[in-house]
């Protein structure tokens, strides 16, 4: 079921602030039909952010991801882009999608499908409010706002489009970077039923350096926030599951965020992942100026995780 590439599936109203390329695993350009050109960045936690293609850091990040993808390919990596419908991974999200919401955009275009491979944690992380704020505490202050769980790789607060939870079905994207080990949303599409991202050994929570996937770009994890906060252990648990705008700038200096505005269908969650609140800080996820994303339900179900209250989120304690 290929749809034409004419329709705009993601519209960015706001652009994210800088995100370390180490935290990014893929990027894609939105369609020309969207009018405002933007680069959609996916973090290792599978959070999506809109970025301005004219900014130098975005250009550098894309270049870096392109190099990584090329290196992966040279090394016999398995990064492939897949077009078409991708079945959801069989691996259930470890923690349930909790707050995730299923997004059903109208897929347009030939994006390659992404498969989120989330681990529940990932999902949780993703759930974390925008990336945790900087948990930069050097341990000195015994409290660290838990940066958003790793799942929330940092991202500027308020700019996140939406998180693609690991457990959702694939989304259609074209990725230009290698798939990063661990929960990943982009499909490593090799088969319609993509294997879980982790290698069996990894699943056991152990990984050995030689694996090729290790080369995937890594993404930083803390919230890019400026304040530090404790990392709460079970910090936040959200109950509501409605269509919630995805995070907004979770990263530290991220500018107003871009969120995905979509009609969402709550997904029943197995449990609410305990999330680490976002770090302290003055930022609060903004729910305004959502991004419009439309996707074809048939093509994919993207899980979106709502962004918790900035205050609700507090770091690890």
């Amino acid at each position: 079921q290929h749809h034409g590439v004419t329709k705009c599936n993601i519209t960015c109203s706001k652009m994210t602030s800088k995100i370390p390329v180490a935290l990014l695993i893929h990027y894609q350009q939105n369609q020309a039909s969207c009018g405002k050109r933007a680069i959609i960045l996916e973090t290792r936690q599978h959070r999506l952010f809109c970025a301005d293609p004219k900014e130098q850091w975005v250009k550098d990040a894309m270049q870096h991801l392109d190099r990584q993808a090329a290196a992966l390919t040279r090394n016999g990596g398995t990064f492939e882009k897949q077009i078409g419908e991708v079945k959801p991974r069989t691996t259930p999200a470890a923690g349930g999608m909790d707050e995730s919401v299923v997004l059903e955009p109208e897929a347009t275009g030939e994006s390659s499908s992404l498969e989120p491979t989330p681990s529940s944690q990932e999902a949780q992380r993703a759930l974390g409010t925008s990336p945790e704020l900087p948990t930069g505490v050097t341990g000195s202050s015994g409290t660290r706002l838990p940066p958003t769980p790793k799942a929330q790789d940092g991202g500027p607060v308020g700019t996140e489009l939406f998180r693609v939870p690991p457990v959702s079905t694939a989304a259609t994207w074209q990725s230009s970077a290698p798939h990063q080990p661990g929960p990943s949303l982009w499909a490593e599409a090799k088969t319609s039923e993509a294997p879980s991202t982790q290698d069996p050994s990894t699943q056991a929570s152990t990984a050995s350096s030689p694996a090729p996937e290790e080369n995937a770009p890594s993404e930083g994890q803390r919230v890019w926030g400026q304040g530090q906060s404790p990392r709460p252990e079970n910090s936040l648990e959200r109950e509501e599951m409605g269509p919630v705008p995805a995070h907004t700038d979770a990263f530290q200096d991220w500018g107003p965020g871009s969120m995905a505005h979509v009609s969402v269908v709550p997904v029943s969650s197995e449990g609410t992942p305990s999330r680490e609140p976002v770090a302290s800080g003055s930022w609060t996820p903004k729910a305004e100026e959502p991004i419009h994303a439309t996707m074809d339900p048939q093509r994919l179900g993207v899980l979106i995780t709502p962004v918790p209250d900035a205050q609700a989120a507090t770091r690890r304690q």
Partner: antibody, heavy 119, light 107 residues
Amino acid sequence: QVQLVQSGAEVKKPGASVKVSCKASGYTFTNYYIHWVKQAPGQGLEWIGWIYPGDGSPKFNERFKGRTTLTADKSTNTAYMLLSSLRSDDTAVYFCATGPTDGDYFDYWGQGTTVTVSS
Amino acid sequence: DIQMTQSPSSLSASVGDRVTITCRASGNIHNFLAWYQQKPGKAPKLLIYNEKTLADGVPSRFSGSGSGTDYTLTISSLQPEDFATYFCQQFWSTPYTFGGGTKVEIK
């Protein structure tokens, strides 16, 4: 309060292996990456790699690939670094550290584990 | 890989002095720079991240600045407890790399 407590000093012979542990407490272990950093005697700091305890996925500095294995045990909130085929230049203090999700800078560190490789 | 070059490698100063340490990256690290302080036999302690954001509990006499490839750590008025070794670290891209360190000694 966040704490990373590492295992004690080790003395090994060349060719042997050593497994250093890092027990985390005070936060949700599976939500934050654990990084490993090497500091040879009188030298600077060198990033070895990270592991995400949530799913066990690792990432390595190419310089340390091949002889280094990073694992995590969610049941005990402990991360491990296994160094195999030890050489004299592996003699160093190894630190585990963790940071926020917005970037991989390290706000909490273990106390360090000294590994001495000597015949 | 991005190389981080720190200078000076050591310096002698007195209490009350203003001290400046620089770190130069081999490529643009977009302000994703952290500074650490390490004392003998101890683990490093985070002072600053994102080029200028002070970590929790760090005295305001420490400040960071810079952009692109050049960054600076400044201690406005050196205190007795500041005599230590300082390292910069870039976290823009992996592998994360550290500067060689600057040892601040008592004059």
